[in-house]
Amino acid sequence: LIIGFGISGRHSITVTTVASAGNIGEDGILSCTFEPDIKLSDIVIQWLKEGVLGLVHEFKEGKDELSEQDEMFRGRTAVFADQVIVGNASLRLKNVQLTDAGTYKCYIITSKGKGNANLEYKTGAFSMPEVNVDYNASSETLRCEAPRWFPQPTVVWASQVDQGANFSEVSNTSFELNSENVTMKVVSVLYNVTINNTYSCMIENDIAKATGDIKVTESEIKRRSHLQLLNSKAS
């Protein structure tokens, strides 16, 4: 969490941002809140990016003002206009790309004063893994697949029964570049699995951590997966 305060002159206002991650090829949110004002026409929101000459986005007098917008953000940005009055200056970014990563500044002017806060925005790819029993294999084998990751993640297997065991000798992980030549498909195979056990396939890079669990019994197979972003630090 980054909390910024205003600059000299007028009173300062508190602006709060949260470091976040964008999944390339999807819309992303750059989070920013501020002390609200009672009059929308008195609020100015400016989003800036380090190393970019033009503005990322500007909202003033109750509407978008995009005449100074940088070309790389043209057609891609929006604030939540109906939520500005309650102090939400968050930015929606369409079709996040790797090049969108960097340091952004959320700069606010209201009748109460000015304030700003920086935000570190990471971009990459992350997806939910799916773990299945590989019936084509000669021995009991599990196959963990996740369609899109970047940067290249690490893959670690764990089991409920053999807690703390190292499965690197009985697993094999491969990374296959996807057609857009950025993200990769992750495939990890675990050999010699035993029945009545729960296995977890954990995929992690510096942006996200995802886990796919599978419980194999003689009568059924149960699966569960979840994904967690790692860098949600507020400022």
């Epitope: 819309d27 995009l66 057609g75 940005t77 929006a78 369409k94 079709n95």
Partner: antibody
């Protein structure tokens, strides 16, 4: 040259299924938001579905649960699987690329007629 | 659900005249996500304006877009014979994700 070419349209009975294809050239489908938009005879444009670069999909309420958008990255082709077709699905179906600057590339359209 | 309402439904003008087409949204739309298209009979739509006011590649400068919030305008400063067509506005980002207006038919008077 950047181009989209649709195929797969035709005459189909109510309740039937059809798969539309949209072959792309000059750009990579999986890097863009790819859409299907339709136009009923004498009517306006209606958005049908989108698949994001990530593979996430969204649908108009009128087709949700019946239509499925997908792509084959190796063939650089977009698809629309249409099941449980109704008379009101009769339209020209266009695929269109959203390259952040709006729907900037459109196919020529393929006609779907649902009639008994 | 966001609704885009275009007016007038039909606009009858002569070549050389100025055309003003309106698109009104039922709730606020980001200027970045507002586009205009032209469609001629038997053809696919063509992108004219994106980001409410930026001309797409190859679009003549007699076409201009303006507006913000809920009110957007497409202006054709001096009508050419090839400009007579149907025009649609379109938004992105609300529910449904993409929405088109019902269209304005620009016809020769």
């Amino acid at each position: 040259e950047v181009q989209l070419v649709e195929s797969g349209g035709g005459l189909i009975q109510p309740g039937g299924s059809l798969r539309l294809s949209c072959a792309a050239s000059g750009f990579i489908v999986s890097r863009n938001y790819m859409n299907w938009v339709r136009q009923a005879p004498g009517k306006g444009l209606e958005w049908v579905s989108v698949i994001y670069g990530s593979g996430r999909t969204y649908y108009a309420d009128s087709v949700k649960g019946r239509f499925t958008i997908s792509r084959d990255n190796s063939k650089n082709t977009l698809y629309l699987q249409m099941n449980s077709l109704r008379a009101e699905d009769t339209a020209v179906y266009y695929c269109a690329r959203d390259a952040d600057y709006g729907l900037d590339v459109w196919g020529q359209g393929t006609t779907v007629t649902v009639s008994s | 659900e966001i609704v885009l309402t275009q007016s007038p439904g039909t606009l009858s003008l002569s070549p050389g005249e100025r055309a003003t087409l309106s698109c009104r949204a039922s709730q606020s739309v980001s200027s970045s996500y507002l586009a205009w298209y032209q469609q001629k009979p038997g053809q696919a739509p063509r992108l004219l304006i994106y980001g409410a006011s930026s001309r797409a590649t190859g679009i003549p400068d007699r076409f201009s877009g303006s507006g913000s919030g809920t009110d957007f305008t497409l202006t054709i400063s001096r009508l050419e014979p090839e400009d007579f067509a149907v025009y649609y506005c379109q938004q992105y980002g609300s529910s449904p994700l993409y929405t088109f207006g019902q269209g304005t038919k620009l016809e020769i008077k």
